[in-house]
């Protein structure tokens, strides 16, 4: 699969990660989490052109298949192949408690 | 995560499984693949509103984000949860072989 | 590496219902693409497609048999069944199962001797 | 039924020659025929798909050729290993239909 720089749409258009900033407020968890108050959320987004980044072989079967069929087949996506940990203070019935979560934060991204 | 029949945008308009029929050639496979001549492709299509099938708790933080800001931030999206073995019989150099690809068809779907 | 192996009753008399089973290693049966054939072979003469049993449950019959053949699979278990019905002695043979690939035997098991005697 | 007919049932050879095993089918079958060895006391082994490929691990002294009607099995520089039974195998449609076999001698 070609790199991240390689991005025959221009520079940062191709699936890679991306970093969101996020209060408590916009993620809905005010009400069951204490901290952090804002999270610097690490999220795939961009554009997946023939072979760019492709996960697999499945990815390479729907951009041939969408190249033929786009209005059936959708082009891969761009989604999370692996994830960073991340702990949250959370509200609990008699205080806080620590938790970590596994599959919240994007790590690096691929295209499926 | 909601199940493929309770699809608020009317039936079968959400991520689910989709079978779609391709040719060696439609593949771009026919210089190196002997059989099957054409294949039953299943893949993960459609939409995935609010919480549909949301794969983990990075897909709620996407949908979360992607209303505060649907310009900076896509909707999740319809991907293999996991997929069905397939076996090529292959062209080398000798002759053929039989290869097992584990990611070439999709066996159910969610969204992220 | 896959492996197959067939196993029987060895002897039988007419009438009687002839119970095959292949045990197999190396593939699975919940494959795209794969199967399971039975053959046979009466000693010093050719072989005879029996059925097959295919990785989304299709199943084919050699039509001449097809009234006294019954195949089913169990895929968790790597195992592939055959019973034939009202055997005589012109069903003694060897009966080989072997993988398939989209419709050829790609290996075979070794067989096991069936001999259906009064 | 289709009918596969390999009309030697016996060729006799010498180590190092050439030889040629041939099968008819009844009707057009493409290339869709396979070819199996089978030696002595053994089970059949797979030797040719789709008429012309060889298997993996198949020496290439033996090629297949052929299309439509007309098949033939190719072994060169024969070995003494070679002596073995030859069939063909049509799986163009069902039943799947094999040939009657030759049987390879070895002077």
């Known amino acids: 699969a070609r790199n991240g720089d390689d991005c025959p749409l221009g520079p940062g258009r191709c699936c890679r990660l991306h970093t969101v900033r996020a209060s408590l407020e916009d993620l809905g968890w005010a009400d069951w989490v204490l901290s952090p108050r804002e999270v610097q959320v690490t999220m795939c987004i961009g554009a997946c052109p023939s072979q760019f980044r492709a996960a697999n072989m499945h990815a390479q079967i729907k951009t041939s298949l969408h190249r033929l069929k786009p209005d059936t087949v959708p082009a891969p996506c761009c989604v999370p192949a692996s994830y960073n940990p991340m702990v949250l203070i959370q509200k609990t019935d008699t205080g806080v408690s620590l938790q970590t979560y596994d599959d919240l934060l994007a790590k690096d991204c691929h295209c499926i | 995560a909601r199940n493929g029949d309770d699809c608020p945008l009317g039936p079968g308009r959400c991520c689910r499984l989709h079978t779609v029929r391709a040719s060696l050639e439609d593949l771009g496979w026919a210089d190196w693949v002997l059989s099957p001549r054409e294949v039953q492709v299943t893949m993960c299509i459609g939409a995935c509103p609010s919480q549909f099938r949301a794969a983990n708790m990075h897909a709620q933080i996407k949908t979360s984000l992607h209303r505060l800001k649907p310009d900076t931030v896509p909707a999740p999206c319809c991907v293999p949860a996991s997929y069905n073995p397939m076996v090529l019989i292959q062209k080398t150099d000798t002759g053929v072989s039989l290869q097992t690809y584990d990611d070439l068809l999709a066996k159910d779907c969610h969204c992220i | 590496q896959v492996t197959l192996k067939e196993s029987g009753p060895g002897i039988l008399q007419p009438s009687q219902t002839l119970s095959l089973t292949c045990s197999f290693s190396g593939f699975s049966l919940s494959t795209y693409g794969m199967g399971v054939g039975w053959i046979r072979q009466p000693s010093g003469k050719g072989l005879e497609w029996l059925a097959n049993?295919?990785?989304?449950?299709?199943?084919y019959y050699n039509s001449a048999l097809k009234s006294r053949l019954t195949i089913s699979k169990d895929t968790s278990n790597n195992q592939v069944f055959l019973k034939i019905s009202s055997v005589d002695t012109a069903d003694t043979a060897t009966y080989y199962c072997a993988q398939m690939a989209y419709s050829w035997f790609a290996y075979w098991g070794q067989g096991t001797l069936v001999t259906v005697s009064s | 039924d289709i009918v596969m007919t390999q009309s030697q049932k016996f060729m006799s050879t010498s180590v190092g020659d050439r030889v040629s095993v041939t099968c008819k089918a009844s009707q057009n079958m493409d290339t869709n025929v396979a070819w199996y060895q089978q030696k002595p006391g053994q089970s059949p082994k797979a030797l040719i798909y789709?008429?012309?490929y060889r298997y993996s691990g198949v020496p290439d002294r033996f090629t297949g050729s052929g299309s439509g009607t007309d098949f033939t099995l190719t072994i060169s520089n024969v070995q003494s290993e070679d002596l073995a039974e030859y069939f063909c195998q049509q799986y163009n449609s069902y039943p799947f239909t094999f040939g009657s076999g030759t049987k390879l001698e070895i002077k």
């Open positions: 049993i295919w990785w989304n449950d299709d199943k």
């Open positions: 789709s008429a012309s």
